[in-house]
């Protein structure tokens, strides 16, 4: 029978910048109960507070809901590990809630073959931001990337879109059966997980050159921009 | 409408006790952070107990450590202080007030009239 | 226990003049956790600044904070009615704590 090994916090993730959610990993045991708080301090502040909820991240976890999250604060956390023979201390983890956002998927992915009388075919792709984010406020720029791929093939085709709502794709295997996703990330902070595929079957008669490739912005009042692959590569962010 | 009512002050002799009550309204009371301050006579402002909105550790001023209690019921929007031991020195109008977020050292945006409790023999 | 002084003590002034109190810390201060209330006579407090120099929801902009370390003020740029009152500076780094008041008085 021992003192409990050291915990480690190692992760904490915000949804939205307005609440969020630290892990740990316990240490060893030591062979009896061992009980686990996390205290924290804002910087600055010469006072220690407990978690406030430590039930809405499931096991090992605190969650500081809206009340307790103040964006451009550090949070310095600490957990502590005691039963009967000790106790053990996780090292310090200092928490900016800016660079740890990791939204949730984009929404409402729409996948359309387009195929204008006067123009070449294309696969529009559309999609919703995540509904936690308020854009409007301008705390956040979203970035998006889409990736698909032809069903049966084992290479996904990234494409880094910027902060755009919806994107155009020429280069495609006509009769070919896509999955097309989205996902999304903030300025600072983490890619979101990706969205549910959407599955598009395209045509027999789709052909287009497969050097170039036909991005729309909605921004640009529904002017379009043709951009090479090159352009398209340099444009992608991992 | 925002507010706070404070009851339960009155006439107590030295040595006695007083349990004051605070009743929130028109907020989401269990977003914040929630104190009492009192202010003596003619006297400025004085923090005396406060805890942040889940009812977690309770913090106090060394003049009232182990005498005074605070409490809150989250359900009723209530807070409560439970004062033991007067002296004459606690006589004074106490506020219930809010912090703006959800910890108790806060800045204090929301105070109530203030509850009088005199401690005389 | 950090303990906040205020200065002047009181300030006679007239309506429409620029008020400035003072207000000094017994140690460093992060500017995240300084506020500044007015009281009026017969009234409760009432939040003008919090976090140094951020106003309250519904305080006029003749109301500025400002300040850093130990050292922190309140400027009022245009003195109203209203404000011939009791202002009171309050720390919350750690167990918070109200400075003694500084009174402003009409001249």
């Known amino acids: 029978q021992l003192p409990p090994g050291k915990p480690e916090i190692f992760k904490c993730r915000s949804p939205n910048k307005e609440t969020f959610t630290c892990w740990w990993r316990p240490g060893t045991d030591g062979g009896l109960p061992t009980n686990y708080s996390l205290t924290y301090h804002r910087e600055g502040e010469t006072l220690m507070h407990e978690c406030p909820d430590y039930i809405t991240g499931g096991p090992n976890s605190c969650h500081f809901g809206k009340q307790y999250t103040s964006m451009w604060r550090t949070y310095i956390m600490m957990v502590n590990a005691t039963n009967q023979m000790g106790s053990s201390f996780s090292d310090e983890l200092y928490v900016d809630v800016t660079y740890i956002v990791q939204p949730d998927p984009p929404l409402e992915l729409a996948v359309e073959v387009k195929q204008p009388e006067d123009r070449k075919p294309y696969l529009w792709i559309k999609w919703s931001p995540p509904t936690l984010i308020d854009l409007k406020t301008g705390w956040f720029t979203l970035l998006y990337e889409i990736r698909l791929k032809p069903e049966k093939a084992a290479e996904w085709e990234i494409h880094f879109a910027g902060q755009q709502t919806e994107f155009k794709i020429l280069s495609l295997h006509p009769g070919q059966k896509y999955l097309v996703q989205v996902r999304c990330k903030p300025d600072h902070g983490y890619w979101s997980a990706w969205s549910p595929a959407t599955f598009i079957q395209i045509p027999s008669d789709f052909t287009m050159n497969d050097e170039q490739k036909l991005i729309s912005e909605e921004d640009l009042g529904g002017e379009q921009k043709l951009i090479s692959e090159e352009d398209l590569h340099h444009h992608h962010h991992h | 409408e925002v507010q706070l009512v404070e009851s339960g002050g009155g006439v107590v002799r030295p040595g006695g006790s007083l349990r004051l009550s605070c009743v929130g309204s028109g907020f989401s009371f269990d977003d914040h952070g929630m104190n009492w301050v009192r202010q003596g006579p003619g006297k400025g402002l004085e923090w005396v107990s406060g805890?942040?909105?889940?009812?977690?550790?309770?913090n106090y001023a060394e003049s009232v450590k182990g005498r005074f209690t605070i409490s809150r019921d989250n359900a009723r929007n209530s807070l409560f202080l439970q004062m033991n031991s007067l002296r004459a020195e606690d006589t004074a109008l106490y506020y219930c007030?809010?912090?703006?977020?959800?910890?108790?050292?806060?800045?204090?945006?929301?105070w109530g009239p203030g509850t009088m409790v005199t401690v005389s023999s | 226990e950090i303990v906040l002084t205020q200065s002047p003590g009181t300030l006679s002034l007239s309506p429409g003049e620029r008020a400035t109190l003072s207000c000094r810390a017994s140690q460093t201060i992060n500017s995240n956790y300084l506020a500044w209330y007015r009281q009026k006579p017969g009234q409760t407090p009432r939040l003008l600044i919090y976090?140094?120099?951020s106003r309250a929801t519904g305080i006029p902009d003749r109301f500025s904070g400002s300040g850093s370390g130990t050292d922190f003020s309140l400027t009022i740029s245009r003195l109203e009615p209203e404000d011939f009152a009791v202002f009171y500076c309050q720390q919350y780094a750690g167990l918070p704590t109200f400075g003694p008041g500084t009174k402003v008085d009409i001249k």
């Open positions: 805890f942040n909105w889940n009812g977690g550790s309770t």
């Open positions: 976090g140094t120099s």
């Open positions: 007030v809010r912090g703006r977020s959800g910890w108790f050292n806060d800045a204090f945006d929301v």
